[in-house]
Amino acid sequence: SDKLYQRKEPVISSVHTKVKGIAEVTENVTEGGVTKLGHSIFDTADYTFPLQGNSFFVMTNYVKSEGQVQTLCPEYPRRGAQCSSDRRCKKGWMDPQSKGIQTGRCVPYDKTRKTCEVSAWCPTEEEKEAPRPALLRSAENFTVLIKNNIHFPGHNYTTRNILPTMNGSCTFHKTWDPQCSIFRLGDIFQEAGENFTEVAVQGGIMGIEIYWDCNLDSWSHHCRPRYSFRRLDDKNMDESFVPGYNFRYAKYYKENNVEKRTLIKAFGIRFDILVFGTGGKF
Amino acid sequence: SDKLYQRKEPVISSVHTKVKGIAEVTENVTEGGVTKLGHSIFDTADYTFPLQGNSFFVMTNYVKSEGQVQTLCPEYPRRGAQCSSDRRCKKGWMDPQSKGIQTGRCVPYDKTRKTCEVSAWCPTEEEKEAPRPALLRSAENFTVLIKNNIHFPGHNYTTRNILPTMNGSCTFHKTWDPQCSIFRLGDIFQEAGENFTEVAVQGGIMGIEIYWDCNLDSWSHHCRPRYSFRRLDDKNMDESFVPGYNFRYAKYYKENNVEKRTLIKAFGIRFDILVFGTGGKF
Amino acid sequence: SDKLYQRKEPVISSVHTKVKGIAEVTENVTEGGVTKLGHSIFDTADYTFPLQGNSFFVMTNYVKSEGQVQTLCPEYPRRGAQCSSDRRCKKGWMDPQSKGIQTGRCVPYDKTRKTCEVSAWCPTEEEKEAPRPALLRSAENFTVLIKNNIHFPGHNYTTRNILPTMNGSCTFHKTWDPQCSIFRLGDIFQEAGENFTEVAVQGGIMGIEIYWDCNLDSWSHHCRPRYSFRRLDDKNMDESFVPGYNFRYAKYYKENNVEKRTLIKAFGIRFDILVFGTGGKF
């Protein structure tokens, strides 16, 4: 609450996160023309990335384009991309939606469709839907430990969200354990009124707000965090503005002296930890 | 404008960026002693990195040191690094400019020059100029979509820069479309009074400032962002303070059971999105 | 000092860091049953990661699990994980401490111990202590150049910590050179009253605070940074809250068409650069 006689100062904050959990992923794997069910295990090194600062990312879904090589090939026949003659294809043209640079030739993509030939990583990425349900949907049961160190330099006061008295096997609960800083990802979504299973398909951004309202006067000292959660991406966003949260990254390798890559389109939840508040002192 | 009767609160912000574009790169490639022109395509997975938060990076230029292996070799003969006898080389010495640890021997680098032998990733990186013009100079035509969600917790008010009425095929223009949040990289530089082609060679840091001056009183409500752009690195910086923006990263691989790496010195533009402003309410 | 007649404005900041240094690492390497001493050189591309924003990370220690492959194997026999019969192992169970999903079988881990079989990256990571002394303990002698550009948009004032008059071969010293922005990592720790050699083993988080107290009135203009240092992680933290600073990442590769990875548990220092302060003008 506002104490007008106090000198207020904004918080200086540092955050450290640690995600725990394992996911079992079952997907169709095609090898030598034969498709069979493949089971694999994803641990933290597989589904999260070494990130600094106030964000962490958990991959919940993906689409792989394996064995791409730099060459010429027909582009993917998405809506409006098909052609019937070379006239439709413009040498040197880069369609922002496309994945390559047109050569000017119209070539067969498959038995029934023709598209403009491109210089690109081939075969070009298929623009297929993200798998539903999400491949790492069990990430709902992962947990994240959040460590937050705060400082009010003007008041020369430092504290942190984890106290020596805390129990490392706790799980945050708004009522029963509101000071525990280990959060189940599914609970964060539930608190924010969101459905993890649904968001995991396309990805999204979730805010974890840590609010410090600190009274630093010795006679009524209080300085503990309050956690709240809200979704930061727009779930009603128009297709053209790229709904959800995803990014592409590549694993490069050489095969018979040819540079190749596996392209991964990773969908997931980016968690932004937003720390704010003030320290007041007479 | 300042309304002294209002309670002002700083903005809490979350940013999500999405870069689009393809670059065609032409460079000299040497294979088995023969040098020929190589053409390659770079897409987002090749020139940008999965980054969180308020920054994104676009690689505009690079220098590669391929097939490095850990062994002994002569260091690169940069200014002041040449030697004529072992006396000039100090066993165990690590010159901050060098890339290895001296063995104490002075050995031939080429027909005319001798340098101190080092234990390092060999052959050591040649300290050659960044290619001019920049290899990915066409990145000027890439676009970035910036999504910004803001929150004034004290006023319990949330909004975002992208409204449902917006058109996903717009491009930001200071006069004609100042609310569009899709920016052409070249336009950002032009607005900041900078030359993209020039900065692309050595790299640099560009600030995209998003200013929210929000009046949250119902009778005169206004809360939309204002975008401005300014260069953040010092273009007049002394050589010793590392002008431009670059970093080195490595791709590791095994060949005949020997650990090797390709070292990439990546030059590029780091874009920092700086969100600030206040929300005022009676 | 507070000038009550001034209009104060918080600082908008952008940071760019550049780490320099080489480490020689000596460790035991086992190949074909023979253990010998291996020497290797780590340069910036090996021990740091391309990071944006107000953080940089320097790896000071590591534990490698080489050649892991997805299969079935006994889990690591940490405290409380051993079994004597299949009854102790629950098919489908994922222990948060474990690295895989139990199959329901109790199998020999070694001659004396049995553990639950898991589907995991095998062999599972041994939960061994971080090497002591730290493998890259010589990182104490690395240096970091910090470039900080600040802006007070309301006062339309911009400046940076590096001035044209500065000398690029300086090293920060609290008394002799308090404006130099090249810092020796060991000095940062000494200033913060911490022991680099000790922290390097388990890792930690170190804050570099840059305080700008700017008087922008023309008649008494002053706007230079003041640097201070403090440790941000809790060195007295309970084991259950994961003391120090580490993360796991993987290098993936294919061998005989089998997907493999080397898992690296990287310990190190994350440096958070915390910029704060105000600009005041009549």
Epitope: - | - | G32, E66, V69, T71, P108, K111, E117, C122, P123
Partner: nanobody
Framework: EVQLVESGGGLVQAGGSLRLSCAAS????????MGWFRQAPGKLREFVAS????????RYIDSVEGRFTISRDNTKNTLYLQMNNLKAEDTAVYYC????????????????????YGQGTQVTVSS
């Protein structure tokens, strides 16, 4: 020093079976993974099958999967290879070896990870 002695080879018709044995002496091999390799005339030595130290996990080359079974008896310091439904392309000298490491799960098929090969036993499959 470890000695490995293979036995059980011979001439057999296509479709027939053989059981190879490998007796170890000089050191207990129960702490080590063990494997079978083979070398056909004019070809490189190739991995056939391997078993980890405890006998719980086994690995095979694709061409013998389902036909060959590797097993061990640690009490007798002996390794076995049961070969069924033999084919002409299985003709080779078969060697046993023990795994020196590191990391059996990843390197079970790499000849350089094994040491102390035996003298070998000839298997000939006539069609």
């Amino acid at each position: 020093e470890v000695q490995l002695v293979e036995s059980g080879g011979g001439l057999v018709q296509a479709g027939g079976s053989l059981r190879l044995s490998c007796a170890a002496s000089g050191r207990t091999v129960s702490d080590y993974g063990m494997g079978w390799f083979r070398q056909a005339p004019g070809k490189l030595r190739e991995f056939v099958a391997s078993i980890n130290w405890s006998g719980i996990y086994t690995r095979y080359i694709d061409s013998v999967e389902g036909r060959f079974t590797i097993s061990r008896d640690n009490t007798k310091n002996t390794l076995y290879l049961q070969m069924n439904n033999l084919k002409a392309e299985d003709t080779a000298v078969y060697y046993c070896a023990y795994f020196l490491g590191p990391n059996w799960y990843s390197n079970y098929g790499r000849p350089s990870s094994y040491g102390f090969y035996g003298q070998g036993t000839q298997v000939t499959v006539s069609s």
